[in-house]
Interface confidence: low
C-alpha cells in the first residue's frame, strides 16, 4: 500500500472513559497534527476511516458500526460509544485519506470500572480553590456535545460517597458547584452525575475531580529567605566542611515557577573549579505554600574558598530576592602560657 504519514501512537492523549457510559472521542489528527479541520478535509474529498487494535492483540481490525442500537457510530470527526463496554479498551486509529493523500494517528482508549463511591483508576483533574477567598465555582467537566441544548439533564453532585445537600458552604447549582468560602475541610473528590434522555434511553455521565484548597493570592508575598541570614556566621578553618543551607519560603501562586539557586562570586557553582555539591529538598504546607532548601556543601574548604561571596537567590512570580551568607575564616585562639608560680604562693 502507498505511504501514509503515520504520527504513531499519541500517548499524550491517554483517554479514559467509564464503563457503561456514553463517550465521544474526537480524531486527534485535526486537533493536534494537521493544520486544517474536518470540514475542510471533507470538502476536499478526503475520507476519515476508523479502526482499532484490541488490548493485548497486534491485529488491526475495522470497527463494527453495525452493532445493535448503533452502540458505536461515527459522526464527522467524532467516534461515539453509546455506551462503552469494558472490552472496548484498545488502541484506536483514525486515518484521513484519498487516492493521493494519507495521514493517520493512533491513541489509547481505556474503559475503566468505578465502584459505588466513584472510586476508579481514572486519573483525576485537580481544581485549586483559594482559601477564604469568597465565592468560587467548579463546573462539571467534559459534558459538552453529549446532548443538545434543548435537553435539560439532571445533575447530582457528590463529595466522596455523599450526595451534596444541606452542606454548610457548598451549594449545587446545576452544572456548577459553588463554594461560599473554601476551607481546608473542603479538600476531596467531587463527582457530578449528569443524567439525560436520548432516543428513549437514559444515559449517565460521571465526572470526578479533586478539589485542593490552596493559599490565596491576597496573602501571597515575594519569596522569603530564612537562611542565610544576618544572625548566622559560617566560621570555618581550612580543611573543614562548609555547609550553608539556603531555605526559602514561597507563597502558593497559581502557575508560578519557584526557583532557588546559589552563586559563588557571581557565577553558577558548576562554572567554578571548586568541588561544590548542592542538594535540594522541598516541602509543602497544607495550602501548598512551598519551602525549598538548597544546601551548598564544600567538603574540604580552603582559605581561598572562605574569601568568596556565597549568595542565595530566589524567585517566584511575586519577585526576586537574594541574600549573601556570612562566611569567614576562623581565627586561631591565642595561646597563653600560664605560669602558676607567678605572683602566688610563699615568698
Amino acid at each position: 500500500s502507498e505511504r501514509c504519514d503515520d504520527w504513531g501512537l499519541d500517548t499524550m492523549r491517554q483517554i479514559q472513559v467509564f464503563e457503561d457510559e456514553p463517550a465521544r472521542i474526537k480524531c486527534p489528527l485535526f486537533e493536534h497534527f494537521l493544520k486544517f479541520n474536518y470540514s475542510t478535509a471533507h470538502s476536499a474529498g478526503l475520507t476519515l476511516i476508523w479502526y482499532w487494535t484490541r488490548q493485548d492483540r497486534d491485529l488491526e481490525e475495522p470497527i463494527n458500526f453495525r452493532l445493535p442500537e448503533n452502540r458505536i457510530s461515527k459522526e464527522k470527526d467524532v467516534l461515539w460509544f453509546r455506551p462503552t463496554l469494558l472490552n472496548d479498551t484498545g488502541n484506536y486509529t483514525c486515518m484521513l485519506r484519498n487516492t493521493t493523500y494519507c495521514s493517520k494517528v493512533a491513541f489509547p482508549l481505556e474503559v475503566v470500572q468505578k465502584d459505588s463511591c466513584f472510586n476508579s483508576p481514572m486519573k483525576l483533574p485537580v481544581h485549586k480553590l483559594y482559601i477564604e477567598y469568597g465565592i468560587q465555582r467548579i463546573t462539571c467537566p467534559n459534558v459538552d456535545g453529549y446532548f443538545p441544548s434543548s435537553v435539560k439533564p439532571t445533575i447530582t453532585w457528590y463529595m466522596g460517597c455523599y450526595k451534596i445537600q444541606n452542606f454548610n458552604n457548598v451549594i449545587p447549582e446545576g452544572m456548577n458547584l459553588s463554594f461560599l468560602i473554601a476551607l481546608i475541610s473542603n479538600n476531596g473528590n467531587y463527582t457530578c452525575v449528569v443524567t439525560y434522555p436520548e432516543n428513549g434511553r437514559t444515559f449517565h455521565l460521571t465526572r470526578t475531580l479533586t478539589v485542593k484548597v490552596v493559599g490565596s493570592p491576597k496573602n501571597a508575598v515575594p519569596p522569603v529567605i530564612h537562611s542565610p541570614n544576618d544572625h548566622v556566621v559560617y566560621e570555618k578553618e581550612p580543611g573543614e566542611e562548609l555547609l550553608i543551607p539556603c531555605t526559602v519560603y514561597f507563597s502558593f501562586l497559581m502557575d508560578s515557577r519557584n526557583e532557588v539557586w546559589w552563586t559563588i562570586d557571581g557565577k553558577k557553582p558548576d562554572d567554578i573549579t571548586i568541588d561544590v555539591t548542592i542538594n535540594e529538598s522541598i516541602s509543602h504546607s497544607r495550602t501548598e505554600d512551598e519551602t525549598r532548601t538548597q544546601i551548598l556543601s564544600i567538603k574540604k574548604v580552603t582559605s581561598e574558598d572562605l574569601k568568596r561571596s556565597y549568595v542565595c537567590h530566589a524567585r517566584s512570580a511575586k519577585g526576586e530576592v537574594a541574600k549573601a551568607a556570612k562566611v569567614k575564616q576562623k581565627v586561631p585562639a591565642p595561646r597563653y602560657t600560664v605560669e602558676l608560680a607567678c605572683g602566688f604562693g610563699a615568698t
Partner: antibody, heavy 124, light 107 residues
Framework: QVQLVESGGGVVQPGRSLRISCAAS????????MHWVRQAPGKGLEWVAI????????YYVDSVKGRFTISRDNSKNTLYLQMNSLRAEDTAVYYC?????????????????WGQGTMVTVSS | DIQMTQSPSSLSASVGDRVIITCRAS??????LAWFQQKPGKCPNLLIY???TLRSGVPSRFSGSGSGTDFTLTISSLQPEDVATYYC?????????FGQGTKVEIK
Amino acid sequence: QVQLVESGGGVVQPGRSLRISCAASGFTFRSYGMHWVRQAPGKGLEWVAIIWHDESYKYYVDSVKGRFTISRDNSKNTLYLQMNSLRAEDTAVYYCARGDYYGSGSYYDAFDIWGQGTMVTVSS
Amino acid sequence: DIQMTQSPSSLSASVGDRVIITCRASQGISNYLAWFQQKPGKCPNLLIYAASTLRSGVPSRFSGSGSGTDFTLTISSLQPEDVATYYCQKYNSAPYTFGQGTKVEIK
C-alpha cells in the same frame, strides 16, 4: 573544555526516520536542560525542542509535535533527537544547545554553549 | 504563541558607526531575552542574556536594553569582525522563539 558535538546527520527519504545525537563534555551534563535548534539552508534559527535535566519536562515546536522525540542519557552525557515521518521542510542544520542550570530556572536559561551542528537532508 | 519581530532585516553601515537592532515581542516577556551573533558557516554565539547582561568575554561595544515587549541591541562602534546575522530570542517559556534575524554588513 566545555563542548557539544552533534552526529548522526545525513540524507534521508521523506517519511523515513533518523536519530541524531549530541555528546556533551566538560560540564555536569545531568544538571542542565538541553535544547535542539535547527536552521534551514539560508534561513533563520528555529527552536525545536527542550528537555529538562531529569527528563521530567519536554516541549516541542508545533511543526514537529508527534513526529520528533527528544531524550537524553545522563549516564552517557548524550542528548538525542529521534525524527520520524521526516519531510522536506525538516532539511536543516540541527544544533544542540545547553539550556538552564538545574536549580536556577530561567536565570541562566540563555543558550550559552552550542554544538557545531549536523546536517539533515530530507530528499527523495 | 509569542511572536518575535526583528527590524531591520538587514543593514549596511560603515566601520565606527553606531548600529541599533530592535526586537519586539507580541506579548510581554519581562527581561527574558537573549541576543546571538552568527557568522556564516558557524554556530550562533550568545552575546547578551536577561535583555541587558553582557556575556563574559563579549566586547563592551555590544549592549542590550529593554523590558516587556521592546528590546534593542546596540553596537556602539561597528568593527569589521561584527559582520554577521544577529538574532533575538525569548526564553521565558517554551516555545523559545527566535526573531527572524538581522544581517549586518559593512559599507
